[in-house]
Every structure is written in structure tokens, then in C-alpha cells.
């Protein structure tokens, strides 16, 4: 008996071939001997089966001695043995219809679990193997689960169902809802305008929800909500914003915040959360602000940074085009009695400059100038 695997919702062609390459009488029946379809001369005739409106054949193939049964919009319950009667012989085809669905939404938050459920006909014993977009293989029976979804799990999952040495392939598109970056860091000189961007790693037609940016300033004992906002069909509207600092927010995606100026009291780290409509849980992105200030007071030239810096970062003070006068893995460095000229304060990581502030030291009788 020939075995054919089909997918729920798909169309399948069950073939039946006669030895004579011409149009002759044929009938397709199910295992209960109920007629599905056949022919009367050139006419297609249909029986009283439950497939009536979903069964078809191809007249053009009859002249070649082929008498297919085409079943559209397959259902699991269409799984059956189908019998083609032609030329006083019977051809049997066993059709097994499978369905594979994500039993939650296919749009899932980062960190959530994905469960795939296989629908199969009674008496079948299929095995399933799925391959994620990043090439990870998972195997299972009727259900497959993947916990802690990551951004790289977004895309097409290809699942192969095996039964009777035959296979059928399912493709399921999964969207992991997350920000493009889990964390970002912005380095600014005191007084500069600060731009925070929170690009999403997915696109959907309609995006609705609400969000908030909580900020923990390095100098503050507790965190504080800087801004709350709503998102409706990708349009952003501010609900509430603190007076200090007075953040501004872009009206369109990607989420974009502007801090008028970087000040030491704002240096620290923030957590932007976004709660999406009809989703449990929230999207998170951490953002850090490091602020640099270079000052000269009397005979002391000082460079300081505030905010979350890694211990391996180097803070240096150097006279332009000269070797660094001072270089330390600390958050403040100074030079006593600096010579006149343009001094540079540099924050660097393994030789790569992250932040730079210049200060002009005038001869001792005049006051310093900051460009």
C-alpha cells in the first residue's frame, strides 16, 4: 500500500494509473467504500463523501491513463485509505495528514518559551525534528519546547515530520520581540546633547503598547522614572516627563530620546521597558550614560568621568602632540601646575578613544578657556 503524507490546509494529489493510456472509467472510494469521485465519459461525478466540495480530478490527465484524486484544504480527519478502482483493479493509497502549530502566538518576547504541537491521525507514530534559524536542532514527539528564546531564534523554523520512512516539511515563522541591543552606552562631554535610541529587532504592521524609562543616577540613592509614553500604531506620545531632566521624545519609531545636555548628575544607567498590547511580559533595554568634565582650578588641571565605566578603561591627561602626563584606571586624574597649551582629556579602551575633552591652559597670569 502506498503511503502519502499531507499537511493540514494543503492540497494533495493521490495518483492512480491505468495501463491503457486513454480515458476509461474510474472511481475513488474511501475505506468505508463511499464513493468520492469518478467519471462518466468526460464528466466528473461526485459521491456523497464528506470530501465532496474539496475533491477534484484533472480531466486533461485522463487521456494519459492518469486518474488523480486531488483533495484541497486537507484536514487531519481526511487521513484514511483511499481506493482507486480502474480496469478491474484496485489501487490503495494511505493518506496521513499532519498539522504543526505554535500553540501560543508566533510573536514571542525574548526569554519566553516556544511550544510546537503536532496534530496527527490516530494510530500514527511520527517523529519530529525542528531546526531553528540559527541551526539548533530539537527533536520530540507530539510536542517540542524551546525555552528562553533569543533574538537569533527569530525567523523560519523548519520542522520535518517522519512517518513510514516518508517525510513532510513544515515551515513556521517565529518573531522574537526584542530590542536590537540588550545594552548600550553613550559617552558625552559635559554640556553636550545626548541622544538615546532604542531600535526594535522586529517589524510588525501595528505596534501598540506603553513604556517607561527608569534612571539610576550614579550620584542618587534611588532610581527615578524619567519618562512614560504610549505607543499606538507605531506613533509615540509622551504621557509624563520629569522636569529635571526635561527629556524630549521622537514621535515615530525607533524610540528616540533626547537629553538637552549631559551633566554629571545625570550620569548613570537607565532601563527602558516596553509593554506590548496582548503580550505578557516586557521588552527591556539598558542604557548607560558616561559624562566627562575637564576643569582647571588655580594650579590644578582635573579630568573626571561619571557613570558606569569598566575598570579596564583608562583616563589620561596629555598636552596636545605629547605623551600622556598622567594615565590611570580611575575616574579622575589631575596635573598640578600644567604648562600652557591645549590639553586633552581622553577616556580610552585598549587604545581606542571613547571620549575626548579639550581644555586650553593659558599662561599663569590669565584665566583658562574651555573651547
Amino acid at each position: 500500500k502506498k503511503v502519502v503524507l499531507g499537511k493540514k490546509g494543503d492540497t494533495v494529489e493521490l495518483t492512480c494509473t491505468a495501463s491503457q493510456k486513454k480515458s476509461i472509467q474510474f472511481h475513488w472510494k474511501n475505506s468505508n467504500q463511499i464513493k468520492i469521485l469518478g467519471n462518466q465519459g468526460s464528466f466528473l461525478t461526485k459521491g456523497p463523501s464528506k470530501l465532496n466540495d474539496r475533491a477534484d480530478s484533472r480531466r486533461s490527465l485522463w487521456d494519459q491513463g492518469n486518474f488523480p484524486l486531488i483533495i484541497k484544504n486537507l484536514k487531519i480527519e481526511d487521513s484514511d485509505t483511499y481506493i482507486c478502482e480502474v480496469e478491474d483493479q484496485k489501487e490503495e493509497v494511505q493518506l496521513l495528514v499532519f498539522g504543526l502549530t505554535a500553540n501560543s502566538d508566533t510573536h514571542l518576547l525574548q526569554g519566553q518559551s516556544l511550544t510546537l504541537t503536532l496534530e496527527s491521525p490516530p494510530g500514527s507514530s511520527p517523529s519530529v525534528q525542528c531546526r531553528s534559524p540559527r541551526g539548533k536542532n530539537i527533536q520530540g514527539g507530539k510536542t517540542l519546547s524551546v525555552s528562553q528564546l533569543e533574538l537569533q531564534d527569530s525567523g523560519t523554523w523548519t520542522c520535518t515530520v517522519l512517518q513510514n520512512q516518508k517525510k513532510v516539511e513544515f515551515k513556521i515563522d517565529i518573531v522574537v520581540l526584542a530590542f536590537q541591543k540588550a545594552s548600550s552606552i553613550v559617552y558625552k562631554k559635559e554640556g553636550e546633547q545626548v541622544e538615546f535610541s532604542f531600535p526594535l529587532a522586529f517589524t510588525v504592521e501595528k505596534l501598540t503598547g506603553s513604556g517607561e524609562l527608569w534612571w539610576q543616577a550614579e550620584r542618587a540613592s534611588s532610581s527615578k522614572s524619567w519618562i512614560t509614553f504610549d505607543l499606538k500604531n507605531k506613533e509615540v506620545s509622551v504621557k509624563r516627563v520629569t522636569q529635571d531632566p526635561k527629556l524630549q521624545m521622537g514621535k515615530k519609531l525607533p524610540l528616540h530620546l533626547t537629553l538637552p545636555q549631559a551633566l554629571p548628575q545625570y550620569a548613570g544607567s537607565g532601563n527602558l521597558t516596553l509593554a506590548l498590547e496582548a503580550k505578557t511580559g516586557k521588552l527591556h533595554q539598558e542604557v548607560n550614560l558616561v559624562v566627562m568634565r575637564a576643569t582647571q582650578l588655580q594650579k590644578n588641571l582635573t579630568c573626571e568621568v561619571w557613570g558606569p565605566t569598566s575598570p579596564k578603561l583608562m583616563l589620561s591627561l596629555k598636552l596636545e602632540n605629547k605623551e600622556a602626563k598622567v594615565s590611570k584606571r580611575e575616574k579622575a586624574v589631575w596635573v598640578l601646575n600644567p604648562e600652557a597649551g591645549m590639553w586633552q582629556c581622553l577616556l580610552s579602551d585598549s587604545g581606542q578613544v571613547l571620549l575626548e575633552s579639550n581644555i586650553k591652559v593659558l599662561p599663569t597670569w590669565s584665566t583658562p578657556v574651555q573651547p
Epitope: 499537511k7 492540497t11 468526460s42 486533461s60 487521456d63
Partner: antibody, heavy 115, light 107 residues
Framework: QVQLQQWGAGLLKPSETLSLTCAVY????????WSWIRQPPGKGLEWIGE???????NYNPSLKSRVTISVDTSKNQFSLKLSSVTAADTAVYYC?????????WGQGTLVTGGG | DIQMTQSPSSVSASVGDRVTITCRAS??????LAWYQHKPGKAPKLLIY???SLQSGVPSRFSGSGSGTDFTLTISSLQPEDFATYYC?????????FGQGTKLEIK
């Protein structure tokens, strides 16, 4: 909702090979036959040939010697190659899904043959 | 090959008119016939299949009849969007063939 999207070179010199591809989105690929049909300027529709997911083909005898239709089930795509084109092959070429009737159709590609 | 002959090759009519287009097959094709509507720059659209079955989403003013060799497409009350070229197609045997088309124009 099944959609067919087709593409390929639109301008050919005499004796070159016409090459078109049609991608099937949002529906079953197996169980159906996938056809190519053309319409020369100011004329009627002409069926070129068809293929199913397993590669079984049927061609119009008038074009059979020059036509090859192939299938790539991994991409849900099928392709048409028509060799040794002439000015008489200038037409809008359509791909379509078929059991007995053509539905739906691709958007059409105007191919200008040489000469 | 089965030849399909449509008549008339063009017809002028007004909105609200009843229009009938005929299609004749060169041999018996029982009910293996479809009708399509084709507008310039667009893909043809299936209207009627199996001679008389209305395709899903097609307005009920379109109807088909006939069997064997003679078939008709009727538009009961012409609407402005119905002005197009109409083709019949036989699915009885390879190669599939179409009628030469009937152009329906505004009077």
C-alpha cells in the same frame, strides 16, 4: 491568500534563451500544477506548459522543442526557459496555478524577443 | 488541439445592459470550460469554472451555462468595472486552449 510573484529578463536578442521564475507565497505548493501562459501584443492567451511539485511536466506541442519548465520545491518556485527566441516570442508571460482552471495568476512580465 | 471560437470578437454596451458572450469548442468538452476577465496591465481573473460554477468573490451578475461544445457567459447588468476582454478556456485535454477573446467596450 496565495500570491504568485514572477521575474526575469525583459529584453532579449535573437537566439537567446528566455528565463523567467515564479515564486509561490502563502499557500500549498504540492497538489497543484504550475503553468506558464503568454499573450503576444494584441493577441489571445497561449498555454505554454506546466509542472507539479515532483517535476512532472506537460508542454504545448507547438513549443515543446524549445521549452523547459523546472521546479525548486525548497523555495516554492518554478521556472520557464524558452530557447532560440525570435520576435514572435515577444509577449507578456504569466505564471499561474492550475488544477483545471488557472487561478491565481502572476502579475505578468513583458518579454521582448529579438529581431 | 481543441479550437475555441468566441463570438462576437467585440461588443459595445452601456452600464445596466445585459450582455451575452458565446464560446464554441471544436469538439465535445462536456463541462470542462472556464471564463476569465482580463483588464489591460492586469493578470486575468477567473470568473466561471466547470461551465457554470461561480468563482468565490465574483459578483452574482456573472453566470455561465452550456455543455458539450456550446457555452455562454452572461453579465446580467453591466457595471463600469466590467469593461474588459473576456476569454474562455477548455480544460478537457492538453494543450489547454483559449478563445481569441471578446472585447467589451463602453457604448
Amino acid at each position: 491568500q496565495v500570491q504568485l510573484q514572477q521575474w526575469g529578463a525583459g529584453l532579449l536578442k535573437p537566439s537567446e534563451t528566455l528565463s523567467l521564475t515564479c515564486a509561490v507565497y502563502g499557500g500549498s505548493f504540492s497538489g497543484y500544477y504550475w503553468s506558464w501562459i503568454r499573450q503576444p501584443p494584441g493577441k489571445g492567451l497561449e498555454w505554454i506548459g506546466e509542472i507539479n511539485h515532483s517535476g512532472s511536466t506537460n508542454y504545448n506541442p507547438s513549443l515543446k522543442s524549445r521549452v523547459t519548465i523546472s521546479v525548486d520545491t525548497s523555495k516554492n518556485q518554478f521556472s520557464l526557459k524558452l530557447s532560440s527566441v525570435t520576435a514572435a516570442d515577444t509577449a507578456v508571460y504569466y505564471c499561474a496555478r492550475v488544477i483545471n482552471w488557472f487561478d491565481p495568476w502572476g502579475q505578468g512580465t513583458l518579454v521582448t524577443g529579438g529581431g | 488541439d481543441i479550437q475555441m471560437t468566441q463570438s462576437p470578437s467585440s461588443v459595445s454596451a452601456s452600464v445596466g445592459d445585459r450582455v451575452t458572450i458565446t464560446c464554441r469548442a471544436s469538439q465535445d468538452i462536456s463541462s470542462w470550460l472556464a471564463w476569465y476577465q482580463h483588464k489591460p496591465g492586469k493578470a486575468p481573473k477567473l470568473l466561471i469554472y466547470a461551465a457554470s460554477s461561480l468563482q468565490s468573490g465574483v459578483p452574482s451578475r456573472f453566470s455561465g451555462s452550456g455543455s458539450g461544445t456550446d457555452f455562454t457567459l452572461t453579465i446580467s447588468s453591466l457595471q463600469p468595472e466590467d469593461f474588459a476582454t473576456y476569454y474562455c478556456q477548455q480544460a478537457n485535454s492538453f494543450p489547454y486552449t483559449f478563445g481569441q477573446g471578446t472585447k467589451l467596450e463602453i457604448k
